[in-house]
């Protein structure tokens, strides 16, 4: 899960090693910050979870793509 | 393509422990979220518990709490669930379940389900 | 946890005839963002693990016949094989996946009359 130390800057120190269905996933942001270890994905779930993810496993890029068309589709 | 290949049938004597093992094949078991799944002659499907990966841990169903436990070989690619404490009502067909599309809170793919019967 | 209730518990259907399976939850269960049904139907035949039918209430699993659909939304769902066949004998499960634990309908067992 990701921590913020001192707010607002949210850092993530573990990556999920195992693929989530795009079914539960709902939206994610990136951390570029320079102040985190390691850059990180967090996925934020149906149910209101966080998880973070590694950006360089595919899943997690097919799973961003998925999103992201998502939010560009409109709804009819 | 998901396989799932689990143990052979086991019969034991109420108060013992099983130990059912479901082995993995044509994923890794860690991309996996592997689940438990039992059902009761003539009876309905009862979830017994998994990994969940939005709560990063295993959890149970709660009337299994304290008495089983769910383990993974990373290895050999094999899960196992161990229950203990052992019951006339746990005579039961256990199946090992996932989603090969990834964590979604149902099973698209199951082992053949292993009988344990549980006799004095 | 979410408590799902299905009905009937069994129906007798002749050969060609209309089956329809009706699966409760009781709490809703669709996702307003996306508007999707989190609820799936599975087929078990005796002495098989079950196998997955339909996912998000209404999407037919690859290589599912085309007789078996899903309709409902929120609390209510129905599971319709319109033309029933000898080979569609089996017992019928719906199973919410919105929240955890996943949490199954009791069953319907479908029979020929």
């Known amino acids: 899960q990701p921590d913020a130390i001192n707010a607002p800057v949210t850092c993530c120190y573990n990556f999920t090693n195992r693929k989530i269905s795009v079914q539960r996933l709902a939206s994610y942001r990136r951390i570029t910050s320079s102040k985190c270890p390691k850059e990180a994905v967090i996925f934020k779930t149906i149910v209101a979870k966080e998880i973070c993810a590694d950006p360089k496993q595919k899943w997690v890029q097919d799973s961003m793509d998925h999103l992201d068309k998502q939010t560009q589709t409109p709804k009819t | 393509q998901v396989q799932l290949v689990q143990s052979g049938a086991e019969v034991k004597k109420p108060g013992a422990s099983v130990k059912v093992s479901c082995k993995v094949s044509?994923?890794?078991?860690?991309?996996?979220?592997m689940h438990w799944v039992r059902q009761a002659p003539g009876k309905g499907l009862e979830w017994m518990g998994g990994?969940?990966?939005?709560?990063?841990?295993?959890i149970h169903a709660q009337k299994f709490q304290g008495r089983v436990i769910m383990t993974e070989d990373t290895s050999t690619d094999t899960a196992y669930m161990e229950l203990s404490s052992l019951r006339s009502e746990d005579t039961a067909v256990y199946y090992c379940?996932?989603?090969?599309?990834?964590?979604?809170?149902?099973?698209?793919?199951w082992g053949q389900g292993t009988l344990v019967t549980v006799s004095s | 946890d979410i408590v799902m209730t299905q009905s009937p518990d069994s129906l007798a259907v002749s050969l060609g005839e209309r089956a329809t399976i009706n699966c409760k939850s009781s709490?809703?269960?669709?996702?307003?963002?996306?508007?999707?049904?989190?609820l799936v139907w599975y087929q078990q035949k005796p002495g098989q693990p079950p196998k997955l039918l339909i996912y998000?209430?209404?999407t037919r699993e690859s290589g599912v016949p085309d007789r078996f659909s899903g309709s409902g939304s929120g609390t209510d769902f129905t599971l319709t094989i319109s033309s029933l066949q000898a080979e569609d004998v089996a017992v019928y499960y719906c199973q919410q996946y919105y929240s955890s634990p996943p949490t199954f309908g009791q069953g319907t067992k479908v029979e020929i009359k």
């Open positions: 998000w209430a209404s």
């Open positions: 044509g994923y890794t078991l860690t991309e996996l979220s």
């Open positions: 990994f969940d990966p939005e709560n990063g841990e295993t």
């Open positions: 709490q809703s269960i669709l996702y307003s963002s996306n508007n999707k049904n989190y």
């Open positions: 379940a996932t989603d090969q599309g990834g964590y979604s809170g149902y099973f698209d793919c």
